[in-house]
Amino acid sequence: EEELQVIQPEKSVSVAAGDSATLNCTVSSLIPVGPIQWFRGAGPGRELIYNLKEGHFPRVTAVSDPTKRNNMDFSIRISNITPADAGTYYCVKFRKGSPDVELKSGAGTELSVRAKPSAPVVSGPAVRATAEHTVSFTCESHGFSPRDITLKWFKNGNELSDVQTNVDPAGKSVSYSIRSTARVLLTRRDVHSQVICEVAHVTLQGDPLRGTANLSEAIRVPPFLEVTQQSMRADNQVNVTCQVTKFYPQRLQLTWLENGNVSRTEMASALPENKDGTYNWTSWLLVNVSAHRDDVKLTCQVEHDGQPAVNKSFSVKVSAHPKEQGSNTAAENTGTNERNIYGGSG
């Protein structure tokens, strides 16, 4: 009597998540009487997948009619495959007994599941950084299989090179995750810039997934301040202008101080946007020179996006002839500024 053979013709089968997988198995003889069972994995911890003798396995069906006694095909079909179904499946013949006695196992068929990566999620720094600083962006994508995957970073269409990428876990798994960090040097022109994380995988058929982040969420462009005096008017009033330029985001509070005392506070709102995404704002203060016996020290104090205030001061000389246009005026700088501005009429 020839020895019973359990034949699993495919060493491996690859299936897309959501599809059905067919695992083939035939036996060379139906003797001795006893069940065929399918297991995932080998050894004592193996998992019963299908028992042709009995049981309820809603996702598994026999490919051939199991009621035909002369049928030697014990192939099964598993529906709605998920990455969790990956593994090596064994078709095993038992001899009827108490307990059933394992007679022979097939060589096994490795089922690999092709699962698409999730849409990449890009996250930027928790706090804004100023131009000329480097910030980190992270990109994450999960649930893909097989492990091979390509991730690229772009800033305004140009590939970034300061990138660190990890795929986890390092060993065999039903599915994998990728996490990548890109370091991006900010410039003042980056308000409209965008970083893109692009993920390519065999399941995507050449159409990579992209996740984006706007640098506008990560950048702070501090303002330039310029204080100037306009011509003195006939009614002894001096018009002093504070020009706040090239800042982002719009959140900005401006306070005028006269000789250290708060004169007026304003909040920026509904400002028109510059081409580069930054904002400008101009504030005027009318000073009645005749009401002052001494020189008036005017300070334009700007608090931008919760940062420490920046001041620009300007002295109005009361002794000057009212009709003169500030030729005897002088400006004074205090605080941290992008550039120095000296007073005088423009």
Partner: antibody
């Protein structure tokens, strides 16, 4: 339709012989383990004999050496040759098909009566 | 040989009742237990195999359970046609053996 029809029963004297036949239709008899089961009048069921797909044969202790099970594939038929019959062999004899994976009985014939009496 | 002991040997019940018949094997038989129904003058009919699987065409009011040595047949709601004799059987090893039968009668 899957069917089993027994024949060959009757009255026989102790020590005599009888050959029971079981004609199968609707399936190939040689692909299944086949059995004979008997039931003495007013008693329960008793398994008698079986023949496997490889031609291997099995008997209950009380009939060993006296009964022989066989099949004829060309006629799709099962047989039970009964020799040295005793009064205790009096029963209705049923031909039964063993089921798909594990030989669970699934199809029964209507039975044929064997009476051993002088 | 493996002995199959059925209980009770007879049982009176009414239409609509739920009844349970038990069978104990003298040694472990895995789940290779079967149940049969026989009416007077008729051949037995196969109801259940591998302890709990219903043969094709058998109504779901019949159910079986058990593994090892103890097995039960339950009929959920008795109908007039269910009054008959029921047999259990082990078919794990030769010689296959039957229980002595349980006669289910109308009360």
């Amino acid at each position: 339709e899957v069917q089993l029809v027994e024949s060959g029963g009757g009255l026989v004297q102790p020590g005599g012989s009888l050959r029971l036949s079981c004609a199968a239709s609707g399936f190939t008899l040689s692909s299944y383990d086949m059995h004979w089961v008997r039931q003495a009048p007013g008693k329960g069921l008793e398994w008698v004999s079986a023949i496997g797909t490889a031609g291997d044969t099995y008997y209950t202790g009380s009939v060993k050496g006296r009964f022989t099970i066989s099949r004829e594939n060309a006629k799709n038929s099962l047989y039970l040759q009964m020799n040295s019959l005793r009064a205790g062999d009096t029963a209705v004899y049923y031909c039964v098909r063993g089921g798909v994976w594990d030989d669970a009985f699934d199809i029964w014939g209507q039975g044929t009566m064997v009476t051993v009496s002088s | 040989d493996i002995q199959m002991t059925q209980s009770p040997s007879s049982l009176s019940a009414s239409v609509g009742d739920r009844v349970t018949i038990t069978c104990r094997a003298s040694q472990g038989i895995n789940n290779y237990a079967a149940w049969f129904q026989q009416k007077p003058g008729k051949a037995p009919k196969s109801l259940i195999y591998t302890a709990s699987s219903l043969h094709s065409g058998v109504p779901s009011k019949f159910s079986g359970s058990g593994s090892g040595t103890d097995f039960t047949l339950t009929i959920s709601s008795l109908q007039p046609e269910d009054f008959a004799t029921y047999y259990c059987q082990q078919y794990v090893s030769y010689p296959y053996t039957f229980g002595q039968g349980t006669k289910l009668e109308i009360k």
